[in-house]
């Protein structure tokens, strides 16, 4: 997993990166399988009705390293892990939701009482 | 400077198998890929699969399933293609070649002759 | 499979001439990343193939400035603009974006 505060840019591969893609799979992507110049990732998000959703695939060299910086944004749980270290690495991810935090009860579009 | 060698030609009778052999020198043998492609007399050139020899992950283009298995030797700087049950359609040149994001530098080539 | 369609399959030139070869695909070769992985290679009778141009018009290392390549999603085009004896042999053009990778069938440039 890429550290919140790496900045350096992103090496470019001398190789294509296969990876394992599931509901993100682009157009030339075969089998399950896209390509990529830049890194694998494996991310968990909520839906509209708050369960929990895998989706992996790849991200291009360009933004990717923006990308796989675990940002955390505001009223939206989601986590993101990216890898490179060999092909279809994706597969071994297994990023967490993080946990609800009290003010997300509050400022969310659903008031609990 | 990049090069890949691969040895001079085989023949072979019908229904055996080959295994041709093509060795990588100039470059770090785990950064790049190693496709091989198949090109018959007059004809167009045909892309068998490809293996990347850092983590031996394996493409293959449908029509040579079974028909065609890539490995590597890293030790060595090897790569291997291993052809089955052998016909006289198999009878070609076989080409490895080194890949990044494209195909940079081949083989010579090694001619396939399947005759009984 | 991406059908790479290659025009003219023989081209008579005259030596000091421009040459043009066209190369189209039966879908684009735009990869998701945003590259476009169309190459061009040229063979020489008993040789193997030697790369000229790779992804569009990037000239690879040692190709002479007279080879110009050109196009986007489903249209490229190779260009000689002065032909000489050691350029005649058969130009492939080939994509690296869909698996299987595929080839075009050859353009072989000859002396008029």
């Known amino acids: 997993k890429k550290e919140d505060g790496e900045s350096t840019a992103p090496t470019p591969r001398p190789k294509v990166l296969r990876c394992k893609c599931h509901h993100h799979c682009p157009e030339d992507s075969v089998n399950n399988i896209c390509s990529t110049d830049g890194y694998c990732f494996t991310m968990i998000e909520e839906d509209d009705s708050g369960l929990p959703v895998v989706t992996s695939g790849c991200l291009g060299l360009e933004g990717s390293d923006f990308q796989c910086r675990d940002t955390p944004i505001p009223h939206q749980r989601r986590s993101i892990e990216c890898c490179t270290e060999r092909n279809e690495c994706n597969k071994d991810l297994h990023p967490t939701l993080p946990p609800l935090k009290n003010r997300d009860f509050v400022d969310g579009p659903i008031h609990h009482r | 400077q990049v090069q890949l060698q691969q040895p001079g030609p085989e023949f072979v009778k019908p229904g055996a198998s080959v295994k041709l052999s093509c060795k990588a020198s100039g470059y770090t043998f785990t950064s790049y890929w190693v496709q091989w492609v198949k090109q018959r007399p007059g004809q167009g050139l045909e892309w068998i699969g490809e293996?990347?020899?850092?983590?031996?992950?394996?493409l293959y283009n449908q029509n040579f399933k079974g028909k065609a298995t890539l490995t590597v030797d890293t030790s060595s700087s090897t790569a291997y293609m291993q052809l089955s049950s052998l016909t006289s359609e198999d009878s070609a040149v076989y080409y490895c070649a080194r890949f990044g994001f494209y195909v940079d530098y081949w083989g010579q080539g090694t001619t396939l002759t399947v005759s009984s | 499979d991406v059908v790479m369609t290659q025009t003219p399959l023989s081209l008579p030139v005259s030596l000091g001439e421009q040459a043009s070869i066209s190369c189209r695909s039966s879908q684009s070769l735009v990869h998701s990343t945003g590259n476009t992985y169309l190459h061009w290679y040229l063979q020489k009778p008993g040789q193997s193939p030697k790369l000229l141009i790779y992804k569009v018009s990037n000239r690879f290392s040692g190709v002479p400035d007279r080879f110009s390549g050109s196009g986007s999603g489903t249209d490229f085009t190779l260009k000689i603009s002065r032909v000489e004896a050691e350029d005649l042999g058969v130009y492939f053009c080939?994509?690296?974006?869909?698996?299987?990778?595929?080839f075009g069938s050859g353009t072989k440039l000859e002396i008029k």
């Open positions: 293996i990347d020899p850092s983590d031996n992950y394996t």
């Open positions: 080939s994509q690296s974006t869909h698996v299987p990778f595929t």
